[in-house]
């Protein structure tokens, strides 16, 4: 039986050109996380392995950058970055669990950054 | 050209233990990760773990963890996999395969295959 | 772990037909996906990755297709050499699994 949950940054917001942390946390079950695979839509940005580590997708490697944590951090945003990311857990033996962030990247420089938190 | 080359078929008993050993060539070792794949007589492709010629890092799939031990000889470009603890349901041919991509564990389809080694596990 | 589950498990057809292969991923891989073929006393030979580009040397006639889900090799016009075992392989979340196998065999 599935029991845990992801808690995520949720809603956020950062300027143009500037950089965010895309943070998901899984709580409420002793399952063993073996993977968290990052994607936006259905593009793999990233994926970090418990035992080989962080795989960066070749297409991104130049403004994604692994961690804190399991998080991401997305640099030199642009505007066509807006849109959803997941954060996908894959454990065991619960199975798969997913997180959903909404970035949205705007143009003026009073863009409110939403609340970020670090995995201890 | 690359080649993976196989050490010859094992007949063990029950509890003991077998390694296989993989020599590569024709390409650099240490760039492409190797894994391990085994064949029960009869049935399908069951993947084992994976493990980085460099580094020596490992990841094995939950089933093996314990029992299994993948390490690497980088002055002879051979990787080796050590399966403890053996039982009848062990009895199959062991694969290593090279990972296609260069210098990391994604994406991971298998473009050049050992030839096999058959164990047997038997009393 | 992700379970791939492929149908039929076997395929008779007859040379020079079409032979269509299913495999199914019981979560999305999206197109982390590969084909390999076997045949007796043999390693597994790699022919499809990305769900759809053939590896080096693979014949036309092989072709894949498919994504997330639900997933298809297709040999347009089977030829003698092609009479094998077919396994496809999600990559994307470890443990990386195999289906079980279609076995395509002469009609």
């Known amino acids: 039986m599935m029991t845990g949950t992801i808690e995520t940054t949720g809603n956020i917001s950062a300027e143009k050109g500037g950089s965010i942390i895309l943070q998901c946390h899984l709580s409420s079950t002793t399952a063993q996380v073996t993977q968290v695979n990052w994607e936006q839509q259905d593009q793999l940005l990233a994926i970090c392995n418990a035992d080989l580590g962080w795989h960066i997708s070749p297409s991104f490697k130049d403004r994604v950058a692994p961690g804190p944590g399991l998080g991401l951090t997305l640099q030199s945003l642009t505007v066509n970055d807006t849109g959803e990311y997941f954060c996908i857990y894959h454990t065991y033996p619960d199975g798969t669990y997913t997180g959903r962030i909404f970035l949205e990247v705007l143009e003026s420089s009073v863009a409110e950054h939403g609340a970020r938190f670090q995995i201890p | 050209q690359v080649q993976l080359v196989q050490s010859g078929a094992e007949v063990k008993k029950p509890g003991a233990s077998v390694k296989v050993s993989c020599k590569a060539s024709?390409?650099?070792?240490?760039?492409?990760?190797m894994g391990w794949v085994r064949q029960a007589p009869g049935q399908g492709l069951e993947w084992m773990g994976i493990i980085n010629p460099s580094m020596g890092a490992t990841s094995y799939t939950q089933k093996f963890r314990g029992r299994v031990t993948m390490t690497r000889d980088t002055s002879t470009s051979t990787v080796y996999m050590e399966l403890s603890s053996l039982a009848s349901e062990d009895t199959a041919v062991y694969y290593c395969a090279r990972l296609h991509v260069s210098g990391s564990y994604y994406p991971a389809y298998l473009d050049y295959w050992g030839q096999g080694t058959m164990v047997t596990v038997s009393s | 772990e992700i379970v791939m589950t492929q149908s039929p498990a076997t395929l008779s057809v007859s040379p020079g037909e079409r032979a269509t292969l299913s495999c199914r991923a019981s979560?999305?891989?999206?197109?982390?996906l590969a084909w390999y073929q076997q045949k007796p006393g043999q390693a597994p030979r790699h022919l499809i990755y990305?769900?759809?580009t053939r590896a080096t040397g693979i014949p036309a006639r092989f072709s894949g297709s498919g994504s997330g889900t639900e997933f298809t090799l297709t040999i347009s016009s089977l030829q003698s050499e092609d009479f094998a075992v077919y396994y496809c392989q999600q990559y994307i979340v470890f443990p990386w699994t195999f289906g079980g196998g279609t076995k395509v065999e002469i009609k």
């Open positions: 990305g769900a759809s």
């Open positions: 979560q999305s891989v999206s197109s982390n």
């Open positions: 024709g390409y650099t070792f240490t760039s492409h990760y």
